[in-house]
């Protein structure tokens, strides 16, 4: 499932490419293995910021599959609560493309755990 | 008024095929995921598949997994749902669903379509 | 697979009076987002089965302000405030935030 949440993004940084959205994003850039659950769901949640910004059913179509193959994934321990970790907020904010490339870090640290 | 209309059920013999559809209109069909759901006589209902606006995604439960393909054709406003090597099981009144969108609205099945049955029998 | 258990399986009401049915989930429902995709569905007799409720609490254009649901997590509710005669049916609860996608079994409200 993690490693199909990696195309989507590739599909989604394609997509955008042709496309001029200049929205900045909340960026977890430096995810804490104690965090990963929250800084996953702050980058879904920006995530359906692009798909609204675009209004590209492509876009649309492969960010909801992404949501849904992550909820898949997560359905384990997608509500743990985990203490001390930034709220979506107090991310920094970054472009797409930097946003995009942190997201494939934190998908990365599930594989690696799973 | 959003109107869907499914056909194609019928008797068929276990192994057997069967493509059922679903004409869409008085909406933007290409707008909206699309799902079928199926009622055995006199049971609940049972979830089948689900395929995203552009038909690129589609997701399944294990039941059917394998040998149930839905698909679209957005220039028709049509979905289908292709059923191959049939199981008595699959005796059901099969209903395509709209869904609204995961991320604009509440991703539920908001409009049913009459349903059509499908009886696998020899 | 997250199973959905509904309870009572019948239900007998007197017009008029209120009803409720319970729907329970094997597993939290809550997405990573932090939604919960819980439908409510009711299937007159002879008729295809049509939304009431969605996202737990969200009543669907054109229902009675008589129906309402409520719950989290793993618990939910969906309450009839006073029943008529039109509310016969079978009524499904439905879970679309981990596939495979699942329904309860069904709650038959019938008139006492």
């Known amino acids: 499932n993690w490693v199909n949440v990696i195309s989507d993004l590739k599909k989604i940084e394609d997509l955008i490419q042709s496309m001029h959205i200049d929205a900045t994003l909340y960026t977890e850039s430096d995810v804490h293995p104690s965090c990963k659950v929250t800084a996953m769901k702050c980058f879904l949640l920006e995530l359906q910021v692009i798909s609204l910004e675009s209004g590209d059913a492509s876009i649309h179509d492969t960010v909801e599959n992404l949501i849904i193959l992550a909820n898949n994934s997560l359905s384990s321990n997608g509500n743990v609560t985990e203490s001390g970790c930034k709220e979506c907020e107090e991310l920094e904010e970054k472009n797409i493309k930097e946003f995009l490339q942190s997201f494939v870090h934190i998908v990365q640290m599930f594989i690696n755990t799973s | 008024e959003v109107r869907l209309m499914a056909s194609g059920g019928g008797l068929v013999q276990p192994g057997g095929s069967l493509r059922l559809s679903c004409a869409a209109s008085?909406?933007?069909?290409?707008?909206?995921?699309m799902s079928w759901v199926r009622q055995a006589p006199g049971k609940g209902l049972e979830w089948v598949a689900t395929i995203s606006r552009g038909g690129d995604y589609t997701y399944y439960p294990d039941s059917v997994k394998g040998r149930f393909t839905i698909s679209r054709d957005n220039s028709k406003n049509t979905l289908y749902l292709q059923m191959n090597s049939l199981r008595a099981e699959d005796t059901a009144v099969y209903y395509c669903a709209r869904r609204v969108s995961m991320i604009t609205g509440g991703w539920a099945m908001d409009y049913w379509g009459q349903g059509t049955l499908v009886t696998v029998s020899s | 697979d997250v199973v959905m258990t509904q309870s009572p399986l019948s239900l007998p009401v007197t017009l008029g009076q209120p009803a409720s049915i319970s729907c329970r989930s094997s597993?939290?429902?809550?997405?990573?987002?932090?939604?919960?995709?819980l439908e409510w569905y009711q299937q007159r007799p002879g008729q295809s089965p049509r939304l009431l409720i969605y996202k737990v609490f969200n009543r669907f254009s054109g229902v009675p302000d008589r129906f309402s649901g409520s719950g989290s997590g793993t618990d939910f509710t969906l309450k009839i405030s006073r029943v008529e005669a039109e509310d016969v049916g079978v009524y499904y609860c439905f879970q679309d935030s981990f596939v495979p996608y699942t329904f309860g079994q069904g709650t038959k409200l019938e008139i006492k």
């Open positions: 008085e909406f933007t069909f290409s707008n909206y995921a």
């Open positions: 597993q939290s429902i809550v997405d990573i987002t932090g939604n919960t995709y």
